[in-house]
C-alpha cells in the first residue's frame, strides 16, 4: 500500500578522528585491539543504520524499530562530509542524481499510519566488513534523540558528540503528495471526472474547479440566473428546464397549447385577459367594446361570446340599426342642429362648432395640432387651450422656459437649460431625467444563492453560509482554516464542520487534552505524566515498559553476600572481594569502620543507595502549560500546541503566511490567529460577505429566496423574469412605473402602485 508520509534523515558529516570502534579497538586492527600508536587513517568503512520508534524518555537501543528502519551504503572512511540538507544540498544532490547516482547519505523511512509527531531516533555508525554480519564488535558509534517533529519541508539539524565519533545530520517528516495535516492522514488527490472535479488546497481540502460545487465537487454550477425550482443542469453553464417550464432561465411557464388571449402562472394554464373567455381565451366577451357595430345611436349589448344585440332608437331598425323610418320625428339632431329626412334616414345641419351625424361631436379645434413642443391641446367650444410641458410656455407653448431654476436635478454634477428641455449631468450610479433613479447594478452576478444588494454605482453580493468571493463563486470550506487542533481531522458539513479527534483529545476543536493519567495506567508506583495526546510513566529502577509493568533483574548473576560494607564474597575458589554494587550504577561506595558504608552519589542522584533521581521538575521550569519530564540531572519540556523551545516559551508567528483575505489585518495568538476584517467582511479569514437578502433584490413586490446555487424571486401575478422585472401583460411592457413602482395592467391600460414617497401616474 502507498505510504502516508516519509521520515527523511540526511547525514551531512561524521568525524571519527581516531578511526576506532566503540569498543576502543581499531576498525581494521587484528584481534580488534587498539594499537599503541593509535589507528591508521581511513581504516573504517563507515555506513549508517537508522532505527525509528515510539517516543521513549529513556531510550532503549534494543527492541523493534516500530516506525521503520533504514541504512546507507558505505559513505566513507573515518571521517566524511556530505552536502547538507536544504537548498544548496538539494542542488548538489540533484546534480548527483542527474549523473545517475543515488543520494548516499539520505535515508527515507516511509510510514503507513497517522504520524504521531513524537518519536525516538537511534542512529548507529558501523564498520563494514565483508566477512562478518553486523555484530556489536563492528559498532563505531550509537547516538539517539527523542522528541517531536511536525510534517514540513524545513529540515531540523541535529548534532551528536558520541564516545568515539561526532555526527551531524538533518531530519524532517513529509506527507506523501496526496496526504495532508499534522498527522499525514488526510487524503486528497486532485481529479477531474464524475467522481469529482477538484484540486487540493494546502490543507488537503477539495477546491472545486470552475463550474463545479458541492462537498465532492460533483454538482455542476448552472447558468447564472437559472431558476433551480424549475430547471437545473448536469454540466456547468447550462439551464435545462423541467417539464412545463421554458425560457433562458426556466422561469416562464408553458401555457396551455393554443391559448390565444391568456397567460399562465403555473404550467398548462390559460388564464384569460380581460374580456376574453373560453378554454383557449379565444372568445371575445366584449364584442361591443372592440367592434362598435350599432349605428344611428343604437345601444350595443354583449350577448354570448362573440355575439351582440343592438337596441335601436325610434325610427331605426336592422341588426345594426342601419335602416331609418321617419327619422326626424325623434329630434335626433343635438346642439341646435336642423333635421332633414333623406332616403337613407335623416341628415343634420349643424351649427358652428359642432359636427357628426347628430351634431353631437364638438368640432376638434385641436385637430390641427396647434400646441407646439408636445403641449397638450384641450378642445373647447369654438376654441382650444394648450397645457404646456414644464419646459415651455406661451399660448401655443412656443416659448422656452428655464427649467433649471426649479432645481430639478437630484444626484447630478450640474443642470443645463436646453431649448425645449434641460439636461441633468448624473453622478455615476444614477440615471433618469432628474438623476433620481439608482441604476440597478444587480444582474444576477451573485452565485450559489447569494443575494445581490444594489449600491450606488455598484453592487454587493451577500453570500449564504459556506460561500464567499465577490460573486459568491468561492465555495468556503469551513475546514480551510484548519480549525481542528492536535491533529484532529476536519469534516466539512453543510452547516459547519466537525472535528474527529485523535486519541487523547476531545472538545469541538480537539483543544481539550484528555488527562490520560486519570486513572493512572502506570504500575508499580510509577509517576504518570500527561502529554499532549499521550502519557509517560517514570518507572522505578526495577521496572520498565510503557506502563512500568515489566520487572527488571536487580542483581544480574545472583545475589551477593556482604562481607564488608562495600565488598562481597567473590565466590568459592576466588580470593579477595568483589564490589557488591550496593550503591547501584549511580553511586560510589565508601567503606566505613565496623563494616558500614556510605554512598557518594553521581550528579542528579540522591538517597542512601543513590537510587533516587533528583526531581529536576520541582521548580516547574516548563512555561505555558508545558509538561515537565524529569531525566537524569536534567529535564525535558513537552510543549502544548502553539509553543516551542526548550522551556515552551517561544510562540511561532501564525500570521506567516498571512491567512487573512479582503485586506483583513492579522494578529498572532497562541497556536491561532485573529483576522480583524474590513467593513462588509466576516469569517475566520475575512472571506465571507456580511449582508443578507434585502428588499431591493426582487422588483415589483417579488419575494426573494436563497435557493442553493442562486437567488430566486417568487414573482406576483403579472410578472416574470429572474428579478420579476419582466411584465407578462402587454400594457406593462416595458415597465412604465419608475422608482420601484409596481405596474398593474388591464387590457391596453395600466396603473402604477407606487412605493412610499412617490406618486403620479408613473411614480415620478
Amino acid at each position: 500500500a502507498r505510504p502516508m508520509g516519509y521520515f527523511e534523515l540526511q547525514l551531512s558529516a561524521l568525524r571519527n578522528v581516531n578511526g576506532e570502534l566503540l569498543s576502543g579497538a581499531c576498525c581494521d586492527g587484528d584481534g580488534r585491539t587498539t594499537r599503541a600508536g593509535g589507528c591508521g587513517h581511513d581504516e573504517c568503512d563507515t555506513y549508517v543504520r537508522v532505527c525509528l520508534k515510539e517516543y521513549q524518555a529513556k531510550v532503549t537501543p534494543t527492541g523493534p524499530c516500530s516506525y521503520g528502519h533504514g541504512a546507507t551504503p558505505v559513505l566513507g572512511g573515518n571521517s566524511f562530509y556530505l552536502p547538507p540538507a536544504g537548498a544548496a544540498g538539494d542542488r548538489a544532490r540533484a546534480r548527483a542524481r542527474a549523473g545517475g547516482d543515488q543520494d548516499p547519505g539520505l535515508v527515507v523511512i516511509p510510514f503507513q499510519f497517522a504520524w504521531p509527531r513524537s518519536f525516538t531516533l537511534i542512529v548507529e555508525a558501523w564498520d563494514w566488513d565483508n566477512d562478518t554480519t553486523p555484530n556489536e564488535e563492528l559498532l563505531i558509534e550509537r547516538v539517539s534523540h527523542a522528541g517531536m517533529i511536525n510534517p514540513e519541508d524545513r529540515w531540523k539539524s541535529l548534532h551528536f558528540s558520541g564516545h568515539v565519533a561526532h555526527l551531524e545530520l538533518q531530519i524532517r517528516v513529509r506527507c506523501d503528495e496526496n496526504y495532508y495535516s499534522a498527522t499525514c492522514n488526510k487524503f486528497c488527490r486532485p481529479r477531474n471526472d464524475f467522481f469529482g472535479h477538484y484540486t487540493c488546497d494546502q490543507y488537503g481540502n477539495k477546491a472545486c474547479m470552475d463550474g463545479w460545487m458541492g462537498k465532492e465537487c460533483k454538482e455542476a454550477v448552472c447558468k447564472q440566473g437559472c431558476n433551480l425550482l424549475h430547471g437545473g443542469c448536469t454540466v456547468p453553464g447550462e439551464c435545462r428546464c423541467s417539464y412545463g417550464w421554458q425560457g433562458r432561465f426556466c422561469d416562464e411557464c408553458v401555457p396551455y397549447p393554443g391559448c390565444v388571449h391568456g397567460s399562465c402562472v403555473e404550467p398548462w394554464q390559460c388564464n384569460c385577459e380581460t374580456n376574453w373567455g373560453g378554454l383557449l381565451c379565444d372568445k371575445d366577451l366584449n364584442y361591443c367594446g372592440s367592434h362598435h357595430p350599432c349605428t344611428n345611436g343604437g345601444t350595443c349589448i354583449n350577448a354570448e361570446p362573440d355575439q351582440y344585440r343592438c337596441t335601436c332608437p325610434d325610427g331605426y331598425s336592422g341588426r345594426n340599426c342601419e335602416k331609418a323610418e321617419h327619422a326626424c320625428t325623434s329630434n335626433p339632431c343635438a346642439n341646435g342642429g336642423s333635421c332633414h329626412e333623406v332616403p337613407s334616414g335623416f341628415e343634420c345641419h349643424c351649427p358652428s362648432g359642432w359636427s357628426g351625424p347628430t351634431c353631437a361631436l364638438d368640432i376638434d379645434e385641436c385637430a390641427s395640432n396647434p400646441c407646439a413642443a408636445g403641449g397638450t391641446c384641450v378642445d373647447q367650444v369654438d376654441g382650444f387651450e394648450c397645457i404646456c410641458p414644464e419646459q415651455w410656455v406661451g399660448a401655443t407653448c412656443q416659448l422656452d422656459a428655464n427649467e433649471c431654476e426649479g432645481k430639478p436635478c437630484l444626484n447630478a454634477f450640474s443642470c443645463k437649460n436646453l431649448i425645449g428641455g434641460y439636461y441633468c449631468d448624473c453622478i455615476p450610479g444614477w440615471k433618469g431625467i432628474n438623476c433620481h433613479i439608482n441604476v440597478n447594478d444587480c444582474r444576477g452576478q451573485c452565485q450559489h444563492g447569494g443575494t445581490c444588494k444594489d449600491l450606488v454605482n455598484g453592487y454587493q453580493c451577500v453570500c449564504p453560509r459556506g460561500f464567499g468571493g465577490r460573486h459568491c463563486e468561492l465555495e468556503r470550506d469551513e475546514c480551510a482554516s484548519s480549525p481542528c487542533h492536535s491533529g484532529g481531522l476536519c469534516e466539512d458539513l453543510a452547516d459547519g464542520f466537525h472535528c474527529h479527534c485523535p486519541q487523547g483529545f476531545s472538545g469541538p476543536l480537539c483543544e481539550v487534552d484528555v488527562d490520560l493519567c486519570e486513572p493512572s495506567p502506570c504500575r508499580n508506583g510509577a509517576r504518570c505524566y500527561n502529554l499532549e495526546g499521550d502519557y509517560y510513566c517514570a518507572c522505578p529502577d526495577d521496572f520498565g515498559g510503557k506502563n512500568c509493568s515489566v520487572p527488571r533483574e536487580p542483581c544480574p548473576g545472583g545475589a551477593c553476600r556482604v562481607i564488608d560494607g562495600c565488598g562481597s564474597d567473590a565466590g568459592p575458589g576466588m580470593p579477595g572481594t568483589a564490589a557488591s554494587g550496593v550503591c547501584g550504577p549511580h553511586g560510589r561506595c565508601v567503606s566505613q569502620p565496623g563494616g558500614n558504608f556510605s554512598c557518594i552519589c553521581d550528579s542528579g542522584f540522591t538517597g542512601t543507595y543513590c537510587h533516587e533521581n533528583i526531581d529536576d521538575c520541582l521548580g516547574q521550569p516548563c512555561r505555558n502549560g508545558g509538561t515537565c519530564i524529569d531525566e537524569v540531572d536534567a529535564f525535558r519540556c513537552f510543549c502544548p500546541s502553539g509553543w516551542e523551545g526548550e522551556l515552551c516559551d517561544t510562540n511561532p508567528n501564525d500570521c506567516l503566511p498571512d491567512p487573512c483575505h479582503s485586506r483583513g489585518r492579522c494578529y498572532d495568538l497562541v497556536n491561532d490567529f485573529y483576522c480583524a476584517c474590513d467593513d462588509g467582511w466576516k469569517g475566520k479569514t475575512c472571506h465571507s460577505r456580511e449582508f443578507q437578502c434585502d428588499a431591493y433584490t426582487c422588483s415589483n413586490g417579488g419575494t426573494c429566496y436563497d435557493s442553493g446555487d442562486t437567488f430566486r424571486c417568487a414573482c406576483p401575478p403579472g410578472w416574470k423574469g429572474s428579478t420579476c422585472a419582466v411584465a407578462k401583460n402587454s400594457s406593462c411592457l416595458p415597465n412604465p412605473c419608475v422608482n420601484g413602482g409596481t405596474c398593474v395592467g388591464s387590457g391596453a391600460s395600466f396603473s402604477c402602485i407606487c412605493r412610499d414617497g412617490w406618486e403620479g401616474r408613473t411614480c415620478t
Partner: antibody, heavy 123, light 107 residues
C-alpha cells in the same frame, strides 16, 4: 500482474440480500477507484457505483441508491458490494473494475476488469 | 442523466474494411469519453480513454476522436479478432453512462 477477482454471486429470492467481494492484487489499492458495473443477460453495460478506497468516498446509480452499499478494506485490498432488497431486474453479471484518475485528463476509463460473477434474483 | 446514443446498433463488415462507430452525448461531456470492446462471455476491455488516447497494448488501428457531444471510434483495417461489441462511456458527470453498444459482425 494486476488482477481483480469477484466472488459471492448466486441465486437469491426477491427481497433478499447478497454480498459480492472484489479482491485486488498487483497494484496500490489506494491509488485507484473501484467500480461495480453490471450487465443483464443480452443487454448492455450499466454502472452500479464506485468507491475511492483512499478516503472512502462513494457514489451510486439512482436505480440502486438506498439498497446497495459499497465499502473497501484497505488492509485486505478488497472492495465489497452489499446488495439488499434485491429485485428481479437486478439479475445480471456483476463486474468490478479499476479506474485510474488524474487531474490533467478528463476521464481515464476503467482499465482492468474482473471476470464477473452472476447474480440471479428469482423466486 | 446524460444519454449516450451509439450508431449504428449493428454493422456487417469484411476483414480489411475501415469501420466507424459514432457516439452522441445528450449534453457536453468535454473529452471524458472511453471506448470498450467486449466479446461474448468476457469482460469489457479498454481501448480509448479521454476521447482520443490509445490505451497501452491496444493496436494502433484503433483510434478515437471528438469532444463536446460527438465522438467517433475508428478501426482503420478490420481484423478477424475485432468482431465484437463496442461501447462508449462518458465519465464527465455522475452517474457515468454507457452507450447501448454497437455489434460488429462478419459480412
Amino acid at each position: 500482474e494486476v488482477q481483480l477477482v469477484e466472488s459471492g454471486g448466486g441465486l437469491v429470492q426477491p427481497g433478499g440480500s447478497l454480498r459480492l467481494s472484489c479482491a485486488a492484487s498487483g497494484f496500490t489499492f489506494t491509488s485507484y477507484d473501484i467500480h461495480w458495473v453490471r450487465q443483464a443477460p443480452g443487454k448492455g453495460l450499466e454502472w452500479v457505483g464506485g468507491i475511492s478506497p483512499a478516503d472512502g468516498d462513494t457514489d451510486y446509480a439512482n436505480s440502486v441508491k438506498g439498497r446497495f452499499t459499497i465499502s473497501a478494506d484497505t488492509s485486505k485490498n478488497t472492495a465489497y458490494l452489499q446488495m439488499n432488497s434485491l429485485r428481479a431486474e437486478d439479475t445480471a453479471v456483476y463486474y468490478c473494475a479499476r479506474n485510474d484518475y488524474d487531474v490533467r485528463s478528463v476521464g481515464s476509463g476503467m482499465d482492468y476488469w474482473g471476470q464477473g460473477t452472476l447474480v440471479t434474483v428469482s423466486s | 442523466d446524460i444519454q449516450m446514443t451509439q450508431s449504428p446498433s449493428s454493422l456487417s463488415a469484411s476483414v480489411g474494411d475501415r469501420v466507424t462507430i459514432t457516439c452522441r452525448a445528450s449534453q457536453d461531456v468535454s473529452t471524458a469519453v472511453a471506448w470498450y470492446q467486449q466479446k461474448p462471455g468476457k469482460a469489457p476491455k479498454l481501448l480509448i480513454y479521454s476521447a482520443s488516447f490509445l490505451y497501452s497494448g491496444v493496436p494502433s488501428r484503433f483510434s478515437g476522436s471528438g469532444s463536446g457531444t460527438d465522438f467517433t471510434l475508428t478501426i482503420s483495417s478490420l481484423q478477424p479478432e475485432d468482431f465484437a461489441t463496442y461501447y462508449c462511456q462518458q465519465s464527465y458527470t455522475t452517474p457515468p453512462t454507457f452507450g447501448q453498444g454497437t455489434k460488429v459482425e462478419i459480412k
